[in-house]
Structure formats: C-alpha cells, structure tokens
C-alpha cells in the first residue's frame, strides 16, 4: 500500500503527460488526481510508465471505482490492462467490440492469459452468444480460441458465425468439439456448389458422420490424407474400399504410409483383403477371402 503523503510543492499534475514518468511512486500517489487520470486514460498508453508506476495508477483507479471500472475507462486502459487480475475483470461490464479489440491488442502475440480469458468470457456472456463479429475478432487474435471452448459453449455459436472460422482456428479442436461445429458448418455452407462447399467444410469434417462422407465420395472431392486422418474412426469404418478410393481420388496412394495409424488401420481390418488388393497399394490386414463378417455389437471374424 502506498503511504499517503502530501504532494511536494510544484508537482501537482495538471494533466496526464510524459513528465509523470519521472515521479516516484509516492509522488504519483500524492500528486495525480484519480478523476483526472480517469478522464485522460487515453494518454496513459502513449507514456512509457514503469510497471511500478502502473501499479500506482491502477491503485488510484481501484479507489475511484471500487465496484469496477466504467467502459469509458476500460476502453483506454492500454497496457495497464496487463496489471488487471481476473477478479478485477469480473467486475466489468464490457459491451463494445471496440473495447474488446483494444484490450486484445495489448496482449497480442502472447498466449491467452487468465485475464484475457476472463475478459472474453465476460464479453461473450454479456452478448448471449458468439456472434460472427465477435468470433471474427477473437479468432484473429487467438486462432486456437474456438478449440478452447467446451462443446456446451460451442453450442451457442450461431451457424452464421462459422463463416469467420479459418482452417487454422480448428487445428487444436478435438472430436467432441468438431461434433458440435460440423452440423453448424454444414448448415452455414449448404447453398454452396460441390467444390466450393468441400473447400469450406473440409476443416470441419472431423465431426462428419458416415452418411456425409459417403455423399462426399460421390462428388470427386479428392480429400487429402491429412484431412482423412482427422475423420472420426466410427465414421470411416463403414466406408467401402470403393467409397474411400472415390473420396481420396489421387491421394489414395497415401493410405500405404498410414496403414499402421488410426483410422486407416482400423478401416483396413474391416475390409475384405481382395477389395483392398484392387487398390494395388499392398495394404495388408484385411479380412481373408472366404471369411464371413457379422456386424455384431463387437467385431468378430468367424470362419
């Protein structure tokens, strides 16, 4: 706590300006009026205050606004935002996307901090849903943002917002998240023609069911192996060799390199060996000729 001392003669701050960087902490505390600071917050970011001096400025704002800062102050916090704790941020009511952008800019290039996560949570909860503009903003600053949300949180993303999602935004998503996002993407892109549709839906296919993969195999999409390897195993298993060949097109040759990895390994185990042989890739491990496959609750091969 900074002790209360009288401001030395001639040092009372008439405005927030660069001369304040030469003030000791106690001088800042004594000579800078909190109300003046609040009205001139936009100037703080242009002044190279030390971290210790920023502590004092924050302390002054905390005293002035014990219930939480107004948005007019929050919008101009600049790098003073880095001094805020999640507890501070939970007191805020941030409604403007411009305010959100201004604060995310301060943290740009760094990992998402607990402060930023709290800020985003407060903002999204205040809006009620992740609208397109918000999602656009968040994924621009944090490509992995979408994949940091729980499936429950993702359910509040309207299909229209999916247009803002770039392939790299989904890089760290797990199957549970893609299960939620895929139907939204399918709805969002439903009016596009075949090739354009595939380009857009490709990143979301980790959540696609078998019937959609079968439909895609009829459209000459030439899915690359990287996308195929991210498909749900349970969605790939029922596909026939012919369907996989059509789905992958010229990329089918890549199956050989992935034959020991899921979902390719599990898919091979479900195919007849003579069907696999038609691919001419030397894939081994299929069901030997003359065996009957019964699709029971658990997989069995009976002679």
């Amino acid at each position: 706590e900074v002790e209360k001392t009288a401001c030395p003669s001639g040092k009372k701050a008439r405005e927030i300006d660069e001369s304040l960087i030469f003030y000791k902490k106690w001088e800042l505390e004594a000579c800078v009026d909190a109300a003046l600071l609040a009205t001139q917050m936009d100037r703080v970011n242009a002044i190279p205050f030390t971290y210790e001096q920023l502590d004092v400025l924050k302390h002054k704002l905390d005293e002035l606004y014990p219930q939480g800062y107004p948005e007019s102050v929050i919008q101009h916090l600049g790098y003073l935002f880095l001094k805020m704790s999640p507890e501070d941020i939970r007191k805020w009511n941030v409604t403007s996307l411009e305010t959100l952008k201004a604060l995310l800019e301060v943290n740009k290039g760094h990992e998402m901090s607990p402060q930023v996560a709290t800020l985003i949570d407060r903002f999204v909860k205040g809006r009620g849903q992740l609208d397109k503009d918000t999602l656009d903003t968040l994924t621009a600053f944090y490509p992995g943002y979408l994949c940091s949300l729980s499936p429950e949180e993702l359910s509040s993303v309207p299909p229209s917002s999916i247009w803002a999602v770039r392939p790299q935004d989904l890089d760290t998503c797990d199957p549970r998240q893609l299960d939620v996002l895929y139907p939204k993407a399918r709805l969002a892109f439903q009016n596009m023609n075949g090739s354009e549709y595939f380009v857009k839906i490709q990143s979301f296919l980790g959540g696609a069911p078998t019937e959609d993969l079968k439909a895609l195999s009829q459209q000459n999409v030439s899915m690359d192996l990287a996308t195929f390897m991210k498909l749900r195993t349970d969605a790939v298993l029922p596909l026939t060799v012919a369907e996989v060949q059509k789905l992958l097109g010229p990329h089918v040759e890549g199956l050989k390199a992935e034959e020991r990895h899921r979902p390719v390994r599990d898919w091979i185990l479900r195919q007849r060996q003579d069907d696999l042989d038609t691919l001419g890739l030397g894939l081994q491990g299929g069901i030997p000729n003359g065996y009957l496959v019964l699709d029971l609750s658990m997989q069995e091969a009976l002679s």
Partner: antibody
Framework: QVQLVQSGAEVKKPGASVKVSCKAS????????IHWVRQAPGQCLEWMGW????????NYAQKFQGRVTMTRDTSISTAYMELSRLRSDDTAVYYC???????????????????WGQGTTVTVSS | SYELTQPPSVSVSPGQTASITCSGE??????VYWYQQKPGQSPVLVIY???KRPSGVPERFSGSNSGNTATLTISGTQAMDEADYYC?????????FGCGTKLTVL
C-alpha cells in the same frame, strides 16, 4: 563526434517571437531528451523545459508556460524552441542540451546535460 | 518551488583544495550534477549522479552528497579551473540550477 549546433544570434522587438533551432549530429536524435536553458547577462542558468524528440512530449517550467513552445523535426534531427511575447528581460543566451532519461526499476530519472549547444544570443530591444 | 543555494564566490590558492557547496531540502535524496562554465563558453558537465566523473574530466574533480548538502571538491586546484560552477538537480521532471559559484584561483 556528438554535437548540437544552434542557429545564429537574433535581435527582436518587444512583443515579437523568436524561434531558435538546435541540430543534433553524431548520435541517435530520438534517443535523448533535449532541454533548453537560458542565461541572461551576468545571471544564473535558468531551465526552460524539455522535449522528447521520440514522442514529441514536452514539459515547460512554470515561468514560461503559455509563452514557450518546443517542437522537433526528426527527419532533420532538429529541435526548436519558440518564445513569444518577448520582453527586454528575455535578452539572454539560449542553450539546448542533450539529456538521457534512465529507466530505473520504479521510475525514470534524467542524467546530466552532457552535451550543450554553443548558445544563441537573443537580444530584445525596441 | 524547489531551490538550490550556492555561495556566490570561493577563492583558493593554486595547488590547494577548493570546496563548493550546494544546499537544498533533502538534496541527499537526489542526484546532483555539476557544470563548469568559463566566460563566453557553454557549460560543461564535470560531475554527474553526485559522485561520478565523465570521461575527459580530470581526476582532481570529485563530488559528494548527503543530507541537505552536495559538495564539489577540486583538489590541487589549477589556474585553468577558474570558472563559474553550477550545481543542478531534478525535482521530478523539472531541472533546477543553483545560481552559480565563481571560483577564483589566487
């Protein structure tokens, strides 16, 4: 070598303005503050204010508030000091000086005025 | 406003030690800078941060600062040291000069 070169002597009438220039060379102009100091004939050194050439930020001595304006042109590494509403007691030699701002843990502090201009004599006379 | 006080003049014989004082409230808490100015010339920094000497300044110049007083000491004073000496400190972001001491080498 590091030097500050000031503009030549000026003679002005009371009420007029004078603008003195200070051209830096031999160092990074935006890396140091420029302070302005004046000295009336036979008198003490009197600090007038400073400008940060990097940000354009200024701070003026109370005595000169409203009459002095400090500016800079980074493209030509030059700082300027303009004093308006001149009076006869503004007759003095005006100096610019280079000062480093040192970042301490808690606050910044100025170091010494390690390089000075040669001075510009300003005479105010009717 | 903050003020620094210096004696108007100090006299010293060649080879002797000259001491020039500068006083101000809690001056010991601040860094003090000393400048030498010869007639018709610009000031030259001879001591910075109270005790440090810039390169090129002779070793006979030294400084100290404690309490309310800073002192510039010139040991083995030479005729060429005859000049006006100004102390200076910063009051936050503003510079304050003493009114100078004329050092006469007898």
């Amino acid at each position: 070598q590091v030097q500050l070169v000031q503009s030549g002597a000026e003679v002005k009438k009371p009420g007029a303005s004078v603008k003195v220039s200070c051209k830096a060379s031999g160092y990074t102009f935006t890396g140091y503050y420029i302070h302005w100091v004046r000295q009336a004939p036979g008198q003490c050194l009197e600090w007038m204010g400073w400008i940060n050439p990097n940000s354009g930020g200024t701070n003026y001595a109370q005595k000169f508030q409203g009459r002095v304006t400090m500016t800079r042109d980074t493209s030509i590494s030059t700082a300027y000091m303009e004093l308006s509403r001149l009076r006869s007691d503004d007759t003095a030699v005006y100096y610019c000086a280079r000062v480093e701002a040192v970042a301490g843990r808690e606050y910044y502090y100025f170091s010494g005025m390690d390089v000075w201009g040669q001075g510009t004599t300003v005479t105010v006379s009717s | 406003s903050y003020e620094l006080t210096q004696p108007p003049s100090v006299s010293v014989s060649p080879g002797q030690t000259a001491s020039i004082t500068c006083s101000g409230e809690k001056l010991g808490d601040k860094y003090v800078y000393w400048y030498q100015q010869k007639p018709g010339q610009s000031p030259v920094l001879v001591i910075y941060q109270s005790t440090k000497r810039p390169s090129g300044v002779p070793e006979r110049f030294s400084g100290s600062n404690s309490g309310n007083t800073a002192t510039l000491t010139i040991s083995g004073t030479q005729a060429m040291d005859e000049a006006d000496y100004y102390c200076q400190a910063y009051h936050a972001s503003t510079a304050v000069f003493g009114c100078g001491t004329k050092l006469t080498v007898l």
